[in-house]
């Protein structure tokens, strides 16, 4: 069930809070409520000033890596779930993340997931 602070969205991004130790992989799951014919799925990090950096993308059955190959998107067999992983997370990867789906014409639409927080802690 959706909590009051995370209302239903056509796009979900979970878990809402994720903590990993540095060096570990951090994996979020971005899920589409329905699968449009043609779409772009982007993974973003949000800066404190609401600026967005695209980390990686899935476009028409192709994975488009971003500037850093540590950020990986994998489509799961059910077609609607996507793993968005940071390989060997670093302390400065801590922050706010979300996914965004751009549904292409003829039904142009943009959906954004709720935001999720990643905390990368020092290795103990």
């Amino acid at each position: 069930l959706d909590s009051p602070d995370r209302p239903w969205s056509p796009l979900t991004f979970s878990p809402a809070q994720l903590t990993v130790q540095e060096g570990e992989n951090a994996t979020f799951t971005c899920s589409l409520a329905d699968i449009p014919d043609s779409f772009v799925l982007n993974w973003y990090r949000l800066s404190p000033r609401n600026q967005t950096d695209k980390l990686a993308a899935f476009q028409e059955d192709r994975i488009e890596p971003g500037r850093d190959r540590r950020f990986r998107v994998t489509r799961l067999p059910n077609g609607r779930d996507f793993h968005m992983s940071i390989v060997a997370a670093r302390l400065n990867d801590s922050g706010i993340y979300l996914c965004g789906a751009i549904y292409l014409p003829p039904n142009t639409q943009i959906n954004e997931s709720p935001r999720a927080e990643l905390s990368v802690t020092e290795r103990t």
């Epitope: 600026q51 476009q59 890596p65 971003g66 500037r67 979300l98 954004e112």
Partner: antibody, heavy 122, light 108 residues
Framework: EVQLVESGGDLVKPGGSLRLSCVAS????????MNWVRQAPGKGPQWVAY????????NYVDAVKGRFTISRDNAKNTLYLQMNSLRAEDTAVYYC???????????????WGQGTLVTVSS | SYVLTQLPSKSVTLNQPAHITCGGD??????VHWYQQKLGQAPVLIIY???IRPTGIPERFSGATSGNTATLTISGALAEDEADYYC???????????FGEGTQLTVL
């Protein structure tokens, strides 16, 4: 069929004012951000301003801040650009362009009009 | 503010591939859109979100973005592809659309 039709371009003297209009049809105007983009003779396009679908958020290129005002009337499916204190360097073809957008996810300029020519000269 | 760098002009032989580049700091972290503009006409979107062709754009046009460079490729340039080509990104810090200065493509 989607259409954006600009009007209001004219020859005006430096320091003068002009109001451009862009009438939209064929799509749900109130769902879209709208932009003005201009192109000076022999130059590339330059983004001028955007306004969000509700009309509550707008931004401008530094060169026109304080002189130009973008606005919209969703009931009339019309976008406006009020241009004051015009300068010779504002001479350009002005295009309106629509854009679907999320809260933080930015889309693309999907539909463009054919443009209206603004000439600022004494 | 964010700057996109394009070569002013490029020549290609008929039916040969043409590669038009657009440079920008960490452009791989942005979505890149490409426009074609012919003389006296409005710009036409030919590639969006780095590599997707809108309906009606010929398959010979493709796009890719990596690191600090976005590339528009025409697999076999035709005479009708003679035009100016502009890249475009959203600068989220300035809240502004940014265009490259354009590349004029000549097909020989």
């Amino acid at each position: 069929e989607v259409q954006l039709v600009e009007s209001g371009g004219d020859l005006v003297k430096p320091g003068g004012s002009l109001r451009l209009s862009c009438v939209a049809s064929g799509f749900t105007f109130s769902r879209y951000y709208m932009n003005w983009v201009r192109q000076a003779p022999g130059k590339g396009p330059q983004w001028v301003a955007y306004i969000n679908n509700a009309g509550s958020d707008r931004n401008y290129v530094d060169a026109v801040k304080g002189r130009f005002t973008i606005s919209r009337d969703n009931a009339k499916n019309t976008l406006y650009l009020q241009m004051n204190s015009l300068r010779a360097e504002d001479t350009a073809v002005y295009y309106c362009a629509s854009e679907i957008r999320g809260v933080v996810v930015v889309g693309h300029l999907d539909y463009w009009g054919q443009g209206t020519l603004v000439t600022v000269s004494s | 503010s964010y700057v996109l760098t394009q070569l002013p002009s490029k020549s290609v032989t008929l039916n040969q591939p043409a590669h038009i580049t657009c440079g920008g700091d960490n452009i791989g972290s942005k979505s890149v859109h490409w426009y074609q503009q012919k003389l006296g006409q409005a710009p036409v979107l030919i590639i969006y979100y780095d590599s997707i062709r809108p309906t009606g754009i010929p398959e010979r046009f493709s796009g890719a973005t990596s690191g600090n460079t976005a590339t528009l490729t025409i697999s076999g340039a035709l005479a009708e592809d003679e035009a100016d080509y502009y890249c475009q990104v959203w600068d989220s810090s300035a809240k502004a659309w940014v265009f490259g200065e354009g590349t004029q493509l000549t097909v020989l």
